[in-house]
C-alpha cells in the first residue's frame, strides 16, 4: 500500500470509559492533526476507516461492526460503543484515505471498572469552587451527543457514595449541581448518573469529578512577605554561614503565577560572583493559599557580603512587593586584656 502519514500513538488523548456504558469517541485526526473537518473530507471523497490492536497484542485487526444490537458502530467521525465491554481496551486507529491521500492516528482506549461507590482508576477532572462566594455550579461533563435534545434524561447526583437529597447547601438542578455557598466540607468527589432510553434499551452515563474549595477572590490580597522583616537582624561574623529565609504568603488566585526571588545589590543571584545557594519549599492551606519559602544561603560570608543589600521580591496577579533583609557585621566583643592595660595606664 502507498505511504500513509502516520501520526503515531497519541498518548495525550488517553481515553478512559466505564465498562457497560455507552461511549462515543471522535477520531482525533479532525480535532488535533488535520486542518479540515470530517464533512469536508467526506465530500472530497475520503473514507474514514477504523481498526484496533487488542491490549497486549501486536496484531492490528478490523473492528467488528456486525455485533448483535450494533454494539459497536461508526457514525461520521465517531466510533460508538453501546455499551463498552472490558475487553474493548486497546489502541484504536482511525485512517482517512482515498487513492492519493492517507493519514492516520492511533489512540489508547481503556475500559475501566467502577465499584458501587463510583471508585475507579479513572483520572478525575478537578473543579475549583471559591469558598463562601455565592452560588456556584458544576455541570455533568461530557454528555453532549449521546442523546437528542428531544430525549429528557433523568440525572441523579451523588457525593461520594451518597445520593444528594436534602443536602444543606448542595442542590441538584438537572445537569447542574448548585452549591448555594461553597464550604470546605463540600470538598470531595461528585458523580452524576445520566439515564436515557434508546431503541427500547436504557443506558447510563457515569461522570465523576473532584470538587476543591479554594480561596475566594473577594479575600485575595497582594503577596505578604512575613520574612525578612524589621524585627529580625541577621548579624554575622565573616566566615560564618548566612541564612536568610524569604517567606511569602499568596492568596489563592485562579490561574495566577506566584513568584519569589532574591536580589543581591539589585542583581539576580545567578548574575553575581559570590557563592549563593537558594532552596525553595512550598506549602498550601486547605483553600490552596500558598506559602513559599526561599532560603538564601552563603556558606562562608565575607565582610563585603555583609555590606550588600539582600532583597526578597514576590509577585502574583494581585501585585508585586519587596522587602530588604537587615544584614550587618557583628561588632567584635571588646578584648578584655586591652581594656585592662588601658585602665592601668601610668598616671
Amino acid at each position: 500500500s502507498e505511504r500513509c502519514d502516520d501520526w503515531g500513538l497519541d498518548t495525550m488523548r488517553q481515553i478512559q470509559v466505564f465498562e457497560d456504558e455507552p461511549a462515543r469517541i471522535k477520531c482525533p485526526l479532525f480535532e488535533h492533526f488535520l486542518k479540515f473537518n470530517y464533512s469536508t473530507a467526506h465530500s472530497a471523497g475520503l473514507t474514514l476507516i477504523w481498526y484496533w490492536t487488542r491490549q497486549d497484542r501486536d496484531l492490528e485487526e478490523p473492528i467488528n461492526f456486525r455485533l448483535p444490537e450494533n454494539r459497536i458502530s461508526k457514525e461520521k467521525d465517531v466510533l460508538w460503543f453501546r455499551p463498552t465491554l472490558l475487553n474493548d481496551t486497546g489502541n484504536y486507529t482511525c485512517m482517512l484515505r482515498n487513492t492519493t491521500y492517507c493519514s492516520k492516528v492511533a489512540f489508547p482506549l481503556e475500559v475501566v471498572q467502577k465499584d458501587s461507590c463510583f471508585n475507579s482508576p479513572m483520572k478525575l477532572p478537578v473543579h475549583k469552587l471559591y469558598i463562601e462566594y455565592g452560588i456556584q455550579r458544576i455541570t455533568c461533563p461530557n454528555v453532549d451527543g449521546y442523546f437528542p435534545s428531544s430525549v429528557k434524561p433523568t440525572i441523579t447526583w451523588y457525593m461520594g457514595c451518597y445520593k444528594i437529597q436534602n443536602f444543606n447547601n448542595v442542590i441538584p438542578e438537572g445537569m447542574n449541581l448548585s452549591f448555594l455557598i461553597a464550604l470546605i466540607s463540600n470538598n470531595g468527589n461528585y458523580t452524576c448518573v445520566v439515564t436515557y432510553p434508546e431503541n427500547g434499551r436504557t443506558f447510563h452515563l457515569t461522570r465523576t469529578l473532584t470538587v476543591k474549595v479554594v480561596g475566594s477572590p473577594k479575600n485575595a490580597v497582594p503577596p505578604v512577605i512575613h520574612s525578612p522583616n524589621d524585627h529580625v537582624v541577621y548579624e554575622k561574623e565573616p566566615g560564618e554561614e548566612l541564612l536568610i529565609p524569604c517567606t511569602v504568603y499568596f492568596s489563592f488566585l485562579m490561574d495566577s503565577r506566584n513568584e519569589v526571588w532574591w536580589t543581591i545589590d539589585g542583581k539576580k543571584p545567578d548574575d553575581i560572583t559570590i557563592d549563593v545557594t537558594i532552596n525553595e519549599s512550598i506549602s498550601h492551606s486547605r483553600t490552596e493559599d500558598e506559602t513559599r519559602t526561599q532560603i538564601l544561603s552563603i556558606k562562608k560570608v565575607t565582610s563585603e557580603d555583609l555590606k550588600r543589600s539582600y532583597v526578597c521580591h514576590a509577585r502574583s496577579a494581585k501585585g508585586e512587593v519587596a522587602k530588604a533583609a537587615k544584614v550587618k557585621q557583628k561588632v567584635p566583643a571588646p578584648r578584655y586584656t586591652v581594656e585592662l592595660a588601658c585602665g592601668f595606664g601610668a598616671t
Partner: antibody, heavy 121, light 110 residues
C-alpha cells in the same frame, strides 16, 4: 407558617434616604437561603434589585444599576434583611417586595406583600 | 447583567383559548428561568421554575419550555382567572448575570 413582611415605606423627599426592612418568620435564617429585593413602579414591570445570603457569610448580588446607591444587609439574629437607599429620586417611587429563594433553580417562591415608597417634595 | 426581552407586551384571547408568551435572554442561561403571574395589588406568584417545571399547586394548563436563550410560556384552556400580567426571570445568579425580569406580558381573557 413561612412569611415575609416589608416595612419602612412611606413618603420621602428627593435626595433623601430610606431604609426598608424585611422581617422573616416561620423559618430559620441560619439555614441557607438567599433573600432578594424586587421593586415595581406604579403601572410598570418588576425590577430586580439584588439578593443577600442569609447564613454567616457575607455575600450579595446586585443589579448593575443598583450598585453604589442601594445596599442590602441582614441580621441573622433578628431574621431581618434591610435595603438602604440613598439619593432618592422620583424614579425610585415603587412598591418594594422582599422575596426568598433556596432551591428549584433559584426561583422566588416566597414573597412579602410589599411596601410602597413615594419620593416627592 | 443579562437582559430579558419578553413578547408580546399584551395579548387578548377568549376563554378556552391558548396564549404563548416568549422570553429571550441576551446570553445563555441554561434552564435557569422562572415564570411568575401577578394580579393587581398582589405580589408575584411562581408558576414555572427551571424553564419547564411546574411549581406546586399550579395547574398543568401552564407549560414552560426552552433552554439557553429562548423560552416560552404556554397557557392553554384559558380561564378568566388567568387574566394577569406574566413575567419571566433569569435565575442564573452569578456575578455576570443577576436576576433580571422580562418586561411583562398582560393577558386579557375575553
Amino acid at each position: 407558617q413561612e412569611q415575609l413582611v416589608e416595612s419602612g415605606g412611606g413618603l420621602v423627599q428627593p435626595e433623601g434616604s430610606l431604609t426598608l426592612t424585611c422581617t422573616a418568620s416561620g423559618f430559620s435564617f441560619s439555614s441557607i437561603y438567599y433573600m432578594c429585593w424586587v421593586r415595581q413602579a406604579p403601572g410598570k414591570g418588576l425590577e430586580w434589585i439584588g439578593c443577600i445570603y442569609t447564613g454567616n457569610s457575607d455575600f450579595t448580588y446586585y443589579a448593575n444599576w443598583a450598585k453604589g446607591r442601594l445596599s442590602i444587609s441582614r441580621s441573622t439574629s433578628l431574621s431581618t434583611v434591610t435595603l438602604q437607599m440613598t439619593s432618592l429620586t422620583a424614579a425610585d417611587t415603587a412598591t418594594y417586595f422582599c422575596a426568598r429563594f433556596r432551591d428549584d433553580y433559584a426561583s422566588l417562591k416566597l414573597w412579602g406583600p410589599g411596601t410602597l415608597v413615594t419620593v416627592s417634595s | 447583567d443579562v437582559v430579558m426581552t419578553q413578547t408580546p407586551a399584551s395579548v387578548s384571547e377568549p376563554v378556552g383559548g391558548t396564549v404563548t408568551i416568549k422570553c429571550q435572554a441576551s446570553q445563555s442561561i441554561s434552564s435557569y428561568l422562572s415564570w411568575y403571574q401577578q394580579k393587581p395589588g398582589q405580589p408575584p406568584k411562581l408558576l414555572i421554575y427551571g424553564a419547564s417545571n411546574l411549581a406546586s399547586g399550579v395547574p398543568s394548563r401552564f407549560k414552560g419550555s426552552g433552554s439557553g436563550t429562548e423560552f416560552t410560556l404556554t397557557i392553554s384552556d384559558l380561564e378568566s382567572a388567568d387574566a394577569a400580567t406574566y413575567y419571566c426571570q433569569c435565575t442564573y445568579y452569578d456575578n455576570n448575570y443577576g436576576g433580571a425580569f422580562g418586561g411583562g406580558t398582560e393577558v386579557v381573557v375575553k
